[in-house]
């Protein structure tokens, strides 16, 4: 039975040209994390593998930085970066847990961080 929950940074906003940290945290399970995939809609941004380290997709290499931890930092944000982001935790023996973050990139300087929320 999958008992874990993914806590994410939730709905967040950031200014155009700025950067933002996407963070997920898996709790309430003793399952071993073997890999974390970061995806934007259906595009793979990056993979962090327990044995093999990081792989950043070539098309995002200039704008994505690994970390902190298993998180991902998006840099030089554009309005086109607005949308859904997913952290996909591959674990043993539980299987896959997915967390969702919605990022809105704003033209103005009124960007504020949203509240944290949990996805069971």
């Amino acid at each position: 039975m999958m008992t874990g929950t993914i806590e994410t940074t939730g709905n967040i906003s950031a200014e155009k040209g700025g950067s933002i940290i996407l963070q997920c945290h898996l709790s309430s399970t003793t399952a071993q994390v073997t890999q974390v995939n970061w995806e934007q809609q259906d595009q793979l941004l990056a993979i962090c593998n327990a044995d093999l380290g990081w792989h950043i997709s070539p098309s995002f290499k200039d704008r994505v930085a690994p970390g902190p931890g298993l998180g991902l930092t998006l840099q030089s944000l554009t309005v086109n970066d607005t949308g859904e982001y997913f952290c996909i935790y591959h674990t043993y023996p539980d299987g896959t847990y997915t967390g969702r973050i919605f990022l809105e990139v704003l033209e103005s300087s009124v960007a504020e961080h949203g509240a944290r929320f949990q996805i069971p």
Partner: antibody, heavy 119, light 107 residues
Amino acid sequence: EFQLQQSGPELVKPGASVKISCRASGYSFTAYSMNWVQQTNGKSLEWIGVINPKFGTTNYNQKFRDKATLTVDHSSSAAYMQLNSLTSEDSAVYFCARNGNFAWYFDVWGTGTTVTVSS
Amino acid sequence: DIQMTQSPASLSASVGETVTITCRASENIFSYLAWYQQKQGKSPQLLAYNAETLAEGVPSRFSGSGSGTQFSLKISSLQSEDFGSYYCQHHFGVPWTFGGGTNLEIK
């Protein structure tokens, strides 16, 4: 104390194979992945590949993909590397070295095994 | 593959001196860099990882710094036991690669 004890030196003929061992002690064998590293002529180090003892998954440096085969034996907490079709260029010291989960540096190294390929 | 270039290849220094070894990566590896020390006929030993975190038991006279593509290892007040070879290794993503090494010898 964490230890990785490797098998003794090997003198092998060109074209032959050799299997060297790395016995782990002082920690949970399946909690750390095992890497193998080649050192030629006491010079620099080259990563050969890694095996995850818990899952049996392997990943190889492209250069060594047809040269090395990595395996583990849980009953003896040992990792093995078989080198095939040996040539004089494979003469080197081979080290096993462990790395932790999401920690991709080598915090404990084996004692080293010298392989000499000569007719 | 990411290439790691170390300099100098060899270095002579006296006990008590301060030396710096540098390592350059062919592409951005952020802070994913480790340093190892190896004595003649022995196995390498981890000195530092994540560019600047010292491994357990490593004396504070060792310090690592850098990020991106440029890194350095500084050894202050050299001790006789510090002489040997030093290697950098990126630990960003496979294949892991090492620098060519720096041989630190007694002057």
